[in-house]
């Protein structure tokens, strides 16, 4: 039960996290005009990964896409790449984890296969979360560097007569959304990995039962289950017996009452 709860919670947390990563990637407010200690402008500038926007105090907002690929800073391209990789990995992870959920039964999928899938999705979520956190952090670092550079020459005078307002940018809402979402995806991934350990069938001690058949004797070997938690392993777990007799422990295990929550 605890395993199912952990897996389910991990899935939900990761789902929220990935939705957040997608939202952050699409948001326009990665960097916003710094209003502190600045002249009160009637224009508010903010920028995203894909376009920059200007909101006038009149209420009119104009956004322009970055229609160039080569002309963009390498750091921005890197952030885009990290966020997209995070989304793709997260989406695949979600797909895999849906089939890995203990509360969903697909055909005669064994627990070991579900354990593998849970681990796979968990690792994908962890990497997805790390990609998002890395992307947002790289962008934040870029902002901090640019902020102090523009603060150094806040006003550039032309012969000391004319002043130019230097637009400084600070952290936008998307950065915080990205950090939180990345963290949630990471936590969800860790929960999935923890759930995987519980899903993996432990070595079960079966009662040694023997009977005499004509001509030769067969004994059940205790510990007939061999757990397979190898990443991507396709090994089938079979009970090792040779004969028709069954112990009470060996009654077919699916569908069990524990498979439905």
């Amino acid at each position: 039960m605890a395993v199912t709860a952990c897996q389910g919670l991990g899935f939900v947390v990761s789902l929220i996290g990935i939705a957040g990563i997608i939202a952050a990637t699409c948001m326009d407010q990665w960097s916003t005009q710094d209003l502190y200690n600045n002249p009160v402008t009637a224009v508010f500038n903010y920028q995203g990964l894909w376009r920059s926007c200007v909101r006038e105090s009149s209420g009119f907002t104009e956004c322009r896409g970055y229609f160039t690929l080569l002309g963009l800073p390498a750091m921005l391209q890197a952030v885009r790449a990290l966020m997209i990789v995070g989304i793709v990995l997260g989406a695949i992870g979600l797909l895999v984890s849906i089939f890995a959920l203990k509360c969903i039964r697909i055909g005669s999928m064994e627990d070991s296969a579900k354990a593998n899938m849970t681990l796979t999705s968990g690792i994908m979520f962890i990497v997805s979360g790390l990609c998002a956190i890395a992307g947002v952090s790289v962008f934040a670092n870029m902002l901090v560097t640019n902020f102090w550079m523009s603060t150094a020459n806040m006003y550039t005078g032309m012969g000391g007569m004319v002043q130019t307002v230097q637009t400084r940018y600070t952290f936008g809402a998307a950065l915080f959304v990205g950090w939180v979402a990345g963290g949630l995806t990471l936590i969800g991934g860790v929960m999935m990995c923890i759930a995987c350990r519980g899903l993996a069938p432990e070595e079960t001690n079966y009662k040694a039962v023997s009977y005499h058949a004509s001509g030769h004797s067969v004994a059940y070997k205790p510990g007939g289950f061999k757990a397979s938690t190898g990443f991507g392993s396709n090994t089938k777990n079979k009970k090792i017996y040779d004969g028709g007799a069954r112990t009470e422990d060996e009654v077919q295990s699916y569908p069990s009452k524990h498979d439905y929550v």
């Epitope: 009160v40 402008t41 009637a42 500038n45 200007v54 006038e56 105090s57 209420g59 002043q163 130019t164």
Partner: antibody
């Protein structure tokens, strides 16, 4: 068509109060930033105050800050300017205007005269 | 505060002539975010409310004749009336629409010679 009609002007003694109103029609008032601009007799234009969309921000000319208050009632499509502690230098024709692209005042009312005199 | 300086104070011309009105701001009105200059030109006739002519320094308001054109960037701006019509004789104001307070120039009076 767009119409802005100011009212509430008149003669008032120094230190007195007055409330100007601006009735708007012909456009989406609630999603428009609105401003008050004044013009002293024989002088140039002077911006007084602006209220942005959704009551988010209000901006004032330094000389009127603390004395004048801009407000709006979207249900009534009306803009107001509450003027307290009036001075002789506040004597002017007060115009209400809508802000459009480029924060430019694209539509203006006909103006209302405020005279501050003892 | 941004100081807007208009020149000349008065311009005397005849109908059909070309009018060039100048406006200078003490600070740049160019917004780096969209590369637009937040300068506006208005026309005011005696006893009337001002009328918007040009915004973003060079964009003509709808309904404004194409003889009116705006140019300039940063701190220096110009309003040009290519061929003066009798109805163009009025007072012209430029306005900073970039930084509060939204200051106006003192105006240029365009009169018939």
């Amino acid at each position: 068509q767009v119409q802005l009609v100011e009212s509430g002007g008149g003669l008032v003694k120094p230190g007195g109060s007055l409330r100007l109103s601006c009735a708007a029609s012909g456009f989406a008032f609630s999603s428009s930033a609105m401003s008050w601009i004044r013009q002293a007799p024989g002088k140039g234009l002077e911006w007084v105050a602006t209220m942005t969309v959704g009551y988010i921000y209000t901006y004032y000319l330094d000389s009127v800050k603390g004395r004048f208050t801009i407000s709006r009632d979207n249900a009534k499509n009306s803009l107001y300017l509450q003027m307290n502690s009036l001075r002789a230098e506040d004597t002017a024709v007060y115009y209400c205007a809508r802000q459009g692209y480029g924060n430019a005042m694209d539509y203006w009312g006909q103006g209302t005269l405020v005279t501050v005199s003892s | 505060d941004i100081v807007m300086t208009q020149s000349p104070g008065t311009l005397s011309l005849s109908p059909g002539e070309r009018a060039t009105l100048s406006c200078r701001s003490s600070q740049s009105l160019l917004n780096s975010g969209n590369q637009k200059n937040y300068l506006t030109w208005y026309q005011q006739k005696p006893g009337q409310a001002p009328r918007l002519l040009i915004y973003w320094a060079s964009t003509r308001e709808s309904g404004i004749p194409d003889r009116f054109s705006g140019s300039g960037s940063g701190t220096d701006f110009t309003l040009t009336i290519s061929r003066l019509e009798p109805e163009d004789f009025a007072v012209y104001y430029c306005q900073n629409n970039y930084i509060y307070p939204l200051t106006f120039g003192q105006g240029t009076k365009l009169e018939i010679k």
